[in-house]
Interface confidence: low
């Protein structure tokens, strides 16, 4: 190509010619070039009109080009140049007109260019200059030359890493002539030992940075006194970890700041063990913004009401413990990436609106309500990248919240109540990667204004997406990626008429169905990449909403066979929606593996008779299989009854219960029956089932056949568990087949009638039979245990060794 | 691949090779040399970066006797008011810095430790350099 050996980054605009051993400016690049990087080439000398071939140039990088001389008019043709970078050039001769013609220059970087003085630097005519970086040079005097009065747009002057030792009143005289200047000045890493008092009197700066300027505490105090009279919007003091630091530092260090007018203060890197860091800041009670970055705060009394700060920032600091914060006027608190103080303790910040507590490894033992933060004004709360956060309140008093971020923290008790019920103003919610297991359909109740919901990297009960979004009518963005989802409710998205972006990628869907998306009138992006989609759920796939513009089906397991021909054809019909079609490849059959789905032509013809016979055969086999499957366990039970006959019962009872009632079974049932008199022996799946044998076989052979009775622990959890109901149905068959058998019902908690009616048989049985009801009172317990023992004693021969157990959670635990 | 020797200590020998095509020169001195049983000292680096060091971070890939540990990301420069003065270094500017280090010893088993250090900086992010350090550890050597 014509531009080689340079690299074309943006055609006709940006070219990178770095380190190509050029001795002269290349002449094979387009006239239209706007960005040109010629760094690390041995150009050595720039003559007049060096860049006449590039009249459109806006950014020119000449770093480390060994340039020693720059002649008059070297850049003469570059009237559009806005950025000129000369870093690392050992300039010895700089003509007075070196920078002439640069009528639009806004940024000049002359770092490490052997510059000894600003006085002789020929930039007085650069009226458009906004940023001048002359750091890492040999400048000894801070005297700002008279030509600075021409630089009325100057915003940044970087004089760091020079040789400035003293600042005198006369040095800044020119700034008095420029009262409207909004200048940020960096003087870090200059070996300062004297600032003449009054030098900064009545000077206004936007920002002043002084880091690693002083070699002793006394020098620091004297120099800060010398800043008296300065009005600065933002003052940054501190040190650097890799530079020589002061030997000592105490609370008197910043006393001189009382004579400055400061709007925002930041202390950056300080590694001293101070008795009480708060005493340092007596002169900073009235700044509006206060920041500590990389400061060691082992002991701190508290940040208390005397401070009038509106914004407090504590970043990358080391704390002995979480600080006590009680600041009446504070509106913004940023407390991020800190170490130590792992347990959040309450703060009292009545005016707080913005709170960022991210990346601290904090544990939070009762989130979240107004009392935690001492405010009802909070609009923004970021608790991301922390430790365990236990939800124990649904944001009472925090109804103003609009932004809430928990990502990559470990949320607990999320499915126990409607955590977000109060947050009707919330617009943004991120609970991605929070170990949340959605087992409660009301999880998002209350979020009527929510527009963005990110919940990637969590999981759902039975890997099924239920109707949890019914109240989120304003949702525009929903991320459900990496949630191990396998199925979704057909009506899961029915209320999301405003949804524009839906990310379902990185799940375990095996088929695609358009039906759930029929109500998404605003949907523009649907991402189903990185699933296992082979085919469609239904024979006939409908169209996606007409608003859809991007459909991502890349990296799925497409089955490119005749039986899926209609699905593959449907995919081709969606071609205009599909993104990255080249990454949509066949996974099966093996001879087509890796082939692009859209370029495939499958010809599929078959004899109609063969199809008819096949379909009929499949139907017959299916019906038989279904019947066998449906009654398989009942048949197995019957076979067992015949085989075992009236064999010896090892257990007094086999207990069926929901794993969610395990505490009660272990702590109450087990304790009282196993350790009582007489002791009863109960069949427990985890103790008495034989490892390696199928669960169903264990239930029937170990549970039913070897037990005299069955105890059924009925509760809300029990009714809602398919596995418990399955066991209960087997128990009924067992009772029917075995004349001696008996089922003892224990109702653990009042079960809603409507729930119970869903299980008609159980409802009838409980209506007709006497059952035991657990009542947690002294008298109630006494009666309960007496009746239960009586029921179990029926037909029991005395056996002094007793153990107690359970039956249903084996399956439930793995399936939920 | 040319091996660059860094130093020897009572229990370790440290060297590095480049793991990128660029192989821009970098000078690394450790004084006194790191002892894995625990030591403190000064790390001196001389380097002329090919990009600004703003937002510099390291990706560390550590191998212990052929066993790979998970990738570790170490952020060195956040982008404003950073801890290290070299974070403000620009492309082509000499970085000549001394960083003090100290660490309490961990009991390392004898063997060969490899650490690939990928330095990434700038916006947009690009690789600055890549070095593969090899540490031969002989716990009982003098």
């Amino acid at each position: 190509e014509s531009w080689e050996p340079c690299v074309e980054v943006v055609p006709n605009i940006t070219y990178q010619c770095m380190e190509l051993n050029f001795y002269k400016i290349p002449d094979n690049l387009p006239f239209s070039t706007k960005n040109l990087d010629l760094s690390f080439n041995p150009l050595r000398h720039l003559g007049s009109y060096s860049f006449f071939s590039f009249p459109e140039l806006q950014v020119l990088d000449l770093s480390r080009c060994e340039i020693q001389t720059i002649e008059d008019g070297a850049y003469q043709s570059l009237s559009h140049l806005s950025t000129l970078i000369l870093t690392g050039n050992p300039i010895q001769s700089l003509a007075l007109g070196a920078f002439s013609g640069l009528s639009s220059l806004q940024k000049l970087v002359a770092v490490e260019t052997n510059l000894a003085s600003l006085e002789n630097f020929p930039i007085g005519h650069l009226k458009t200059l906004k940023e001048l970086n002359v750091a890492h040079n040999l400048i000894q005097s801070f005297k700002l030359p008279e030509y600075f009065s021409n630089l009325t747009n100057l915003e940044h002057l970087d004089l760091s890493s020079n040789k400035i030792q003293s600042i005198y009143c006369t040095d800044l005289r020119v700034l008095h002539q420029m009262p409207l200047l909004n200048l940020s000045l960096d003087l870090s890493l200059n070996p300062m030992n004297f600032i003449q008092p009054g030098a900064f009197k009545e000077i206004r700066l936007h920002k002043l940075t002084l880091r690693n300027n002083f070699d002793s505490l006394n020098v620091m105090k004297t120099c800060i006194q010398g800043l008296a009279g300065l009005e600065v919007h933002r003052l940054v003091l501190g040190e650097f970890r890799n530079e020589g630091n002061l030997e000592k530092f105490d609370k008197s260090a910043l006393e001189g700041l009382c004579n400055l007018t400061i709007e925002e203060f930041r202390l950056a890197y300080l590694d001293y063990y101070l008795d009480d860091i708060i005493d340092l800041f007596n002169c900073l009670t009235n700044v509006s913004s206060f920041s500590l970055v990389s400061v060691t705060i082992e002991r701190v009394k508290d940040f208390s009401y005397n401070f009038g700060w509106q914004h407090l920032e504590l970043v990358n600091c080391k704390f002995g413990q979480f600080p006590t914060l009680k600041l009446k006027s504070l509106k913004r608190l940023t407390f991020t990436s800190n170490k130590g103080g792992n347990a959040f303790s309450e703060v009292d910040l009545p005016s707080l609106e913005f709170l960022d507590l991210s990346r601290n490894g904090l544990s939070f033992k009762g989130c979240c309500s107004q009392s935690d933060f001492g405010t009802t004004s909070l609009k923004y709360l970021d608790l991301s990248f922390n430790g365990v956060i236990t939800m124990s309140s649904n944001f009472l008093g925090l109804e103003q919240l609009e932004h809430l971020d928990f990502q990559h923290s470990n949320l607990k008790q999320m499915s126990e109540f409607s955590v977000f019920l109060s947050l009707r103003n919330l617009i943004y919610l991120d609970i991605s990667h929070t170990h949340t297991r959605v087992a409660f359909n009301g999880i998002f109740n209350g979020l009527s204004s929510l527009e963005v919901l990110k919940m990637a990297g969590n999981s759902f009960q039975e890997n099924f997406l239920p109707d949890i979004f019914t109240e989120l009518r304003n949702l525009t963005f929903l991320d459900l990626s990496q949630c191990q989802l396998e199925q979704l409710s057909p009506t899961a998205f029915n209320s999301l008429s405003s949804l524009q972006v839906l990310n379902m990628s990185h799940n375990n869907f095996f088929s695609l169905d358009t039906f759930p998306y029929k109500c998404l009138n605003s949907l523009q992006v649907l991402d189903y990449s990185l699933n296992h989609i082979m085919t469609s759920k239904k024979q006939e796939l409908q169209h996606f909403p007409s608003s859809l513009a991007f459909l991502n089906l890349t990296q799925n397991d497409f089955a490119c066979t005749c039986e899926h021909q209609s699905f593959l054809q449907w995919i081709k019909d969606q071609r205009q929606l599909l993104v990255e079609v080249e990454r949509m490849e066949c996974a099966t059959p093996s001879d087509k593996q890796g082939m692009p789905v859209l370029s495939l032509n499958i010809t599929c013809q078959m004899n109609k008779t063969i199809i008819g016979v096949s379909v009929l055969s499949v139907l017959v086999v299916s019906v038989v299989a279904v019947l066998v499957y449906k009654f398989y366990f009942h048949l197995m039970l019957l076979a067992g009854c015949i085989k075992y006959g009236r064999g010896e019962n090892i257990y007094d009872a086999f207990v069926i219960y929901s794993s969610q009632d395990e505490d009660w079974v272990r702590n109450e049932l087990v304790k009282n029956l196993e350790e009582g008199v007489p002791p009863f022996q109960l069949c427990l799946h985890y103790r008495d089932f034989i490892p390696g044998v199928a669960i169903a076989a264990n239930i029937i052979h170990e549970g039913f056949h070897k037990s005299r009775k069955v105890i059924v622990v009925v509760s809300q959890h029990f009714i809602q568990s398919r596995w418990c109901i399955f066991e209960y149905e087997i128990a009924q068959t067992w009772q029917f087949l075995s004349s001696r058998a008996g089922i003892i019902f224990i109702v653990l908690q009042k079960v809603e009638k409507t729930l119970l009616r869903q299980q008609v048989e159980l409802y009838r049985l409980l209506s007709r039979n006497t059952y035991l009801e657990w009542e947690d009172s002294v008298l109630g317990r006494h009666i309960f245990w007496r009746r239960l023992r009586k029921a179990l004693l029926d037909g029991k021969s005395w056996n002094p060794e007793g153990t107690v157990g359970t039956g249903c959670n084996w399956q439930e635990a793995t399936s939920i | 691949q040319k091996q660059y020797w860094v130093c020897n200590s009572s229990d370790a020998s440290i060297s590095y090779t480049y793991c990128d095509k660029m192989q821009y020169p970098i000078s690394i001195n450790v004084n006194p040399c790191i002892e894995l049983k625990g030591s403190k000292g000064l790390l001196h680096i001389f380097y002329i970066p090919r990009r600004d060091l703003k937002q510099l971070y390291f990706n560390l890939y550590i191998t212990v006797n052929t066993m790979n540990l998970p990738k570790r990301k170490e952020v060195i420069c956040r982008g404003s008011d950073d801890d290290y003065s070299f974070c403000r270094a620009l492309k082509g500017e000499t970085v000549n810095t001394t960083i003090s280090f100290s660490f309490k010893g961990i009991k390392f088993s004898k063997g060969k430790y490899k650490c690939v250090v990928e330095a990434i900086s700038g916006s947009p992010e690009e690789m600055l350099f890549c070095l593969e350090f090899v540490i031969l550890h002989q716990p009982n050597s003098n």
Epitope: D302, G320, T324, N342, A343, E346, S363, G366, G387, V388 | -
Partner: antibody, heavy 120, light 106 residues
């Protein structure tokens, strides 16, 4: 119901060490802080420190740093206080108490106390 | 550390009388807890976070205060209220108790 059961009284010699236990029932110690408090005759209550069993984290009043060590074993739902280099000043009743977020980490349940007597 | 000073250190009250125990802090705290300890028993939580009554505590007890001054009031003293009362702050490390007020019933 919530209970904290402390180990029995201890008579120890000066210079020795003692380890007191506090076994919780009715709640999981991982969900709370466990505090230890000292009560000497004719003195008020003195806070020794707390442990956060979930994060294996303990914090001490500087006066007890080096003297007391608080640990917890979540498997047995038990917290421990170990006191070293005992002197007559350490003769006191030591209480464990639960700090629970439902009452803003106030100590809502207390053990019955363990009397430690240091005497030669 | 924050020093909590309780006054009076000993107080004598008649049955049915209203009394107030005070607790002053050497510097501002966010809130105060109060405990009651009867002779030979463990302390018992009375008031948490300045004014919230702990469960099972009679309504004759109430708390108030802010900043450096907090108080516990018993509206109508009963014989069973004879005990030591301690204030306790948990908002600034290290967490401290007051020296206690001993309430005697005449």
């Amino acid at each position: 119901q919530v209970q904290l059961q402390q180990s029995g009284a201890d008579l120890v010699r000066p210079g020795a060490l003692v380890k007191l236990s506090c076994t919780a029932s009715g709640f999981n110690i991982k969900d709370s802080y466990i505090h230890w408090v000292k009560k000497r005759p004719e003195w008020g209550l003195e806070w020794i420190g707390w442990t956060d069993p979930e994060n294996v984290n303990s914090i001490y009043d500087p006066r007890f740093q080096g003297k007391a060590s608080i640990t917890a074993d979540t498997s047995s739902n038990t917290a421990f206080l170990q006191l070293t280099s005992l002197t007559s000043e350490d003769t006191a009743v030591y209480y464990c108490a639960r700090g629970y977020n439902g009452v803003y980490y106030a100590m809502d349940y207390w053990g019955q106390g363990t009397t430690v007597t240091v005497s030669s | 550390q924050i020093v909590l000073t309780q006054s009076p250190s000993i107080m004598s009250a008649s049955l049915g009388e209203e009394i107030t125990l005070t607790c002053s802090a050497s510097s501002s705290v966010i809130y105060m807890h109060w405990y009651q300890q009867k002779s030979g028993t463990s302390p018992k939580l009375l008031i948490y976070r300045t004014y919230n009554l702990a469960s099972g505590v009679p309504s004759r007890f109430s708390g108030s205060g802010s900043g450096t001054f907090y108080s516990l009031t018993i509206s109508s003293v009963e014989a069973e209220d004879a005990a030591d009362y301690y204030c306790h702050q948990w908002s600034s490390f290290p967490y401290t108790f007051g020296g206690g007020t001993k309430l005697e019933i005449k």
